[in-house]
């Protein structure tokens, strides 16, 4: 799979295979993996991938089941480099500030929050 | 403060502390903190906060600032509260693959993804 | 590498209102490690900062500016705007848009805006 | 506001260094960024956080701040150093920037 193809346009095509092959997938009944209780998807990456990597193992590989798995590992590439981005830019306390509002103002608007 | 106040109010009035204590915690002219690159901030909540606690030990406390903090560090509570939820429940796959859709769903629709 | 380029009008007639807009290309102007800055330079003069944005819509202007200036920013499209009102001949100038993450990083060429009627 | 003050022109002959100075309260204790700018061209950072020089501008170029003059100095003058020089800070109780009036540099000869 070239990596050149847009983020964006690889996540479209991974939501179709994952439709496409979503019998075969179910087809094993006794695997359990954990699935998160709440909608904030950001904060459970690593799950969500860990989950991926358990259902790959117990998966028979070939033809496009196994481009599934690697575009999804692909996203996982890009999302390990997005959290790279979070400490790179050291910047006034500023800036800084302005972040952490729009953050709070984010999870205050968007945000599944339950008390 | 009391941790009954339920976590959209506690955010609500965090941003309008932020506002108010804003002059006195830019006044530090060369501290540098870490600042996210993009805007997909639950990705970055481990630096925003290591930035707040950068912050915190370098502004004089006292007064509703200690509570600016504290409340900040009731909604890491929070937060590190939603990433143990991200593991706990073992479902089946097609459990899993429904949160996967819905994840690759969001990612499709709402996150800023730059190639 | 981050290009920046102004566009706009270069005559404007005094009273009304200067519009200029920058166009970010080679970079995100969602980067939350930049804010998105208006300077000017009259003739022969030395620069002037007019105020910064950051993606989220937070603004800062110069004091001396702040009742006449509106500074945008359209992230669908990675453009920033400036609007000037109520414009007279001491507005004639280059005018710059910059990104500013510590210092300013990069520039536009710089466009000149000349208020004559 | 906070205000800085640079001498309208400075004027050096080849191989000799430079001074130019940037004056403002206290301003030892801010940050302070210098920009090059030659006719018709938009201005280029040449020292930053005193004293730091970005990758590409030559060694000659130096930077030092205390008390409430902060410098920038230019060894070996060359040529084509000659342009006008800006100083900037951040004006922190604000969060503003600041520009001092920029220093015309001549190099003589």
């Known amino acids: 799979i070239p990596t050149e193809i847009p983020t964006s346009a690889l996540v479209k095509e991974t939501l179709a295979l994952l439709s496409t092959h979503r019998t075969l997938l179910i087809a094993n009944e006794t695997l359990r993996i954990p699935v998160p209780v709440h909608k904030n998807h950001q904060l459970c990456t690593e799950e969500i991938f860990q989950g991926i990597g358990t259902l790959e193992s117990q998966t028979v590989q070939g033809g496009t089941v196994e481009r599934l798995f690697k575009n999804l590992s692909l996203i996982k590439k890009y999302i390990d480099g997005q959290k790279k981005k979070c400490g790179e830019e050291r910047r006034r306390v500023n800036q800084f500030l302005d972040y952490l509002q729009e953050f709070l103002g984010v999870m205050n608007t968007e945000w599944i929050i339950e008390s | 403060i009391p941790t009954e106040i339920p976590t959209s109010a506690l955010v609500k009035e965090t941003l309008a502390l932020l506002s108010t204590h804003r002059t006195l915690l830019i006044a530090n002219e060369t501290l540098r903190i870490p600042v996210p690159v993009h805007k997909n901030h639950q990705l970055c909540t481990e630096e925003i906060f290591q930035g707040i606690g950068t912050l915190e030990s370098q502004t004089v406390q006292g007064g509703t600032v200690e509570r600016l903090f504290k409340n900040l560090s009731l909604i890491k509570k929070y937060i590190d509260g939603q990433k143990k939820k991200c593991g706990e429940e073992r479902r089946r796959v097609n459990q899993f693959l429904d949160y996967l859709q819905e994840f690759l769903g969001v990612m499709n629709t709402e996150w800023i993804i730059e190639s | 590498q981050v290009q920046l380029q102004e566009s706009g009008p270069g005559l404007v007639k005094p009273s009304q209102t200067l519009s200029l807009t920058c166009t970010v290309s080679?970079?995100?102007?969602?980067?939350?490690?930049?804010?998105w800055s208006w300077i000017r330079q009259h003739p022969g003069k030395g620069l002037e900062w007019i105020g910064y944005?950051?993606?989220?819509?937070?603004?800062y202007y110069n004091p001396s500016l702040k009742s006449r200036v509106t500074i945008s920013v359209d992230t669908s499209k990675n453009q920033f705007s400036l609007k000037l009102s109520s414009v007279t001949a001491a507005d004639t100038a280059v005018y710059y848009c910059a990104s500013l993450g510590n210092w300013f990083d990069y520039w536009g060429q710089g466009t000149l805006v000349t208020v004559s009627s | 506001s906070y205000v800085l003050t640079q001498p309208p022109s400075v004027s050096v002959a080849p191989g000799q260094t430079a001074r130019i100075t940037c004056g403002g309260n206290n301003i030892g204790s801010k940050n302070v960024y210098w920009y090059q700018q030659k006719p018709g061209q938009a201005p280029v950072l040449v020292v930053h956080?005193?004293?730091d020089r970005p990758s590409g501008i030559p060694e000659r170029f130096s930077g030092s701040n205390s008390g409430n003059t902060a410098t920038l100095t230019i060894s070996r003058v060359e040529v084509g150093d000659e342009a006008d020089y800006s100083c900037q800070v951040w004006d922190s109780s604000s969060a503003h920037v600041v520009f001092g009036g920029g220093t015309k540099l001549t190099v003589l000869g």
């Open positions: 956080d005193d004293s």
């Open positions: 944005i950051y993606y989220s819509g937070s603004t």
């Open positions: 080679g970079g995100s102007i969602s980067n939350g490690g930049y804010y």
